[in-house]
Amino acid sequence: EEELQVIQPEKSVSVAAGDSATLNCTVSSLIPVGPIQWFRGAGPGRELIYNLKEGHFPRVTAVSDPTKRNNMDFSIRISNITPADAGTYYCVKFRKGSPDVELKSGAGTELSVRAKPSAPVVSGPAVRATAEHTVSFTCESHGFSPRDITLKWFKNGNELSDVQTNVDPAGKSVSYSIRSTARVLLTRRDVHSQVICEVAHVTLQGDPLRGTANLSEAIRVPPFLEVTQQSMRADNQVNVTCQVTKFYPQRLQLTWLENGNVSRTEMASALPENKDGTYNWTSWLLVNVSAHRDDVKLTCQVEHDGQPAVNKSFSVKVSA
């Protein structure tokens, strides 16, 4: 009698994550009587994938009706494939007994899973930094296979070069992750700037995935202060202005001091935005000169975004 053959015609099968995979297996003879089982891997640590007789295998179905008389097709379909399903699958014939005895295994079919990278997530520094400082942005994407991937950073469309990228794990795995850090030098004009992390992979239909971060979340542009006096009014009052310009973010508190004593405190709110994303604010203080015998020292004190206060002083001359 001819020796039983267990035929797995495909050496390898590749599928996209989320799809179904069909693993083909036929036997050359109905005898000896005994079941077919599917395993992933070989040797003592192999994992049972499908056993017609018992067990609950929710994602695995038989392609043909295995209970049908004279059935020699023991192909299976695994639905909703994930990268974790990758491996070599063996169709194994057993001889019926107590217990069943393994008789012959197919040559195995390697299942390869291609999976798309997740949308890149870009995170910036925890605290704001001022212009001329360098900040780091991190981009992460996960779950892709195969391992080959390209990641590029752009600031306002220009590719960044101060970049460090790692793909993990280094060895063979069912899926991979990428993590990249880009160092970006901030300028005062960066409030409206954007960094983009662009990930390209074989599974993407020609269009890279992009993650973005706005530099407005990472930058602090400290204000310029200028205190000036308007001409004396007829009622002996002097109008002194404090111009606070080119600052970001808007969070700003301004305090007027007359000879070191707090005269008034104001909070910036609902300011119009400059073209470059920064803000300007002007505060006025009326000083009654006739109420003073000596010159008045006026100080405009600005506390911006929780930073130490910045002062600009001005002396109003009181004529004898």
Epitope: K11, S12, S14, V15, A16, S112, R114, P146, D148, I149, T150, A200, H201, V202, T203, L204, Q205, G206, D207
Partner: antibody, heavy 116, light 109 residues
């Protein structure tokens, strides 16, 4: 799933010509599509692709002479400043469902002859 | 750009012969290699993708192997319908560009 090229004809050197690839059975917004050519008796040559969102990418030799664009059911190849060496059969093809590294569906091709 | 060198450029074989065609990339393309069959006046047909995966509907006598820079297409037992020209095609994941080998013509001995 089918691809059919059209627009191939005899063209004069220095003129322009637009080839079209009409698709059926799938959406152009889901796949990368490519243009290739084959001069008589020669091998296959890659011209360029257009991504699912409509971004074109070209072989380095194209140098701006060819432009790939698409609508919902057709992909076009506009060829400017035709030369005799552009004489070839032009094929359009679709990448496979698993990735952009291979082309599993091809059109039958359309012949372009450039001669004065 | 990556260069793909295919060899031999032509070969003569008989029905039933085992035929091997090789393709070498000028730099590593990992496993991003496809093989196509083309008959005169026809469009190419995909045989193998990702270096070793048989495309659906392609007879199992065709097989592919290799990774990195060296790849092989094997026809285990040549059939009359297999007389054609075979091309390898690479995809480079960094440049995202495609390159073909110059082709191998398989003729009847």
């Amino acid at each position: 799933v089918q691809l059919v090229e059209s627009g191939g004809r005899l063209g004069q050197p220095g003129t322009s010509l637009t080839l079209s690839c009409t698709v059926s059975g799938f959406s152009l917004s889901s796949y990368v599509m490519g243009w290739f050519r084959q001069a008589p008796g020669k091998g296959l040559e890659y011209i360029g692709i257009i991504s699912s969102s409509g971004s074109p990418y070209y072989a380095s030799w194209v140098n701006g002479r060819f432009t790939i664009s698409k609508t919902s059911t057709t992909m076009d190849l506009k060829m400017n400043s035709l030369r005799s060496e552009d004489t070839a059969t032009y094929f359009c093809a679709r990448v496979g469902p698993l990735g952009v590294d291979y082309f599993n569906i091809w059109g039958p091709g359309t012949l372009v002859t450039v001669s004065s | 750009d990556i260069q793909m060198t295919q060899s031999p450029s032509s070969l003569s074989a008989s029905v039933g012969d085992r035929v091997t065609i090789t393709c070498r990339a000028s730099q590593s393309i990992n496993s991003y290699l496809a093989w196509y069959q083309q008959k005169p006046g026809k469009a190419p047909k995909l045989l193998i993708y990702s270096a070793s995966f048989l495309y659906s509907g392609v007879p199992s006598r065709f097989s592919g192997s290799g990774s990195g820079t060296d790849f092989t297409l094997t026809i285990s037992s040549l059939q009359p319908e297999d007389f054609a020209t075979y091309y390898c095609q690479s995809w480079h994941y960094i440049s995202r560009s495609y390159t073909f080998g110059q082709g191998t013509k398989v003729e009847i001995k």
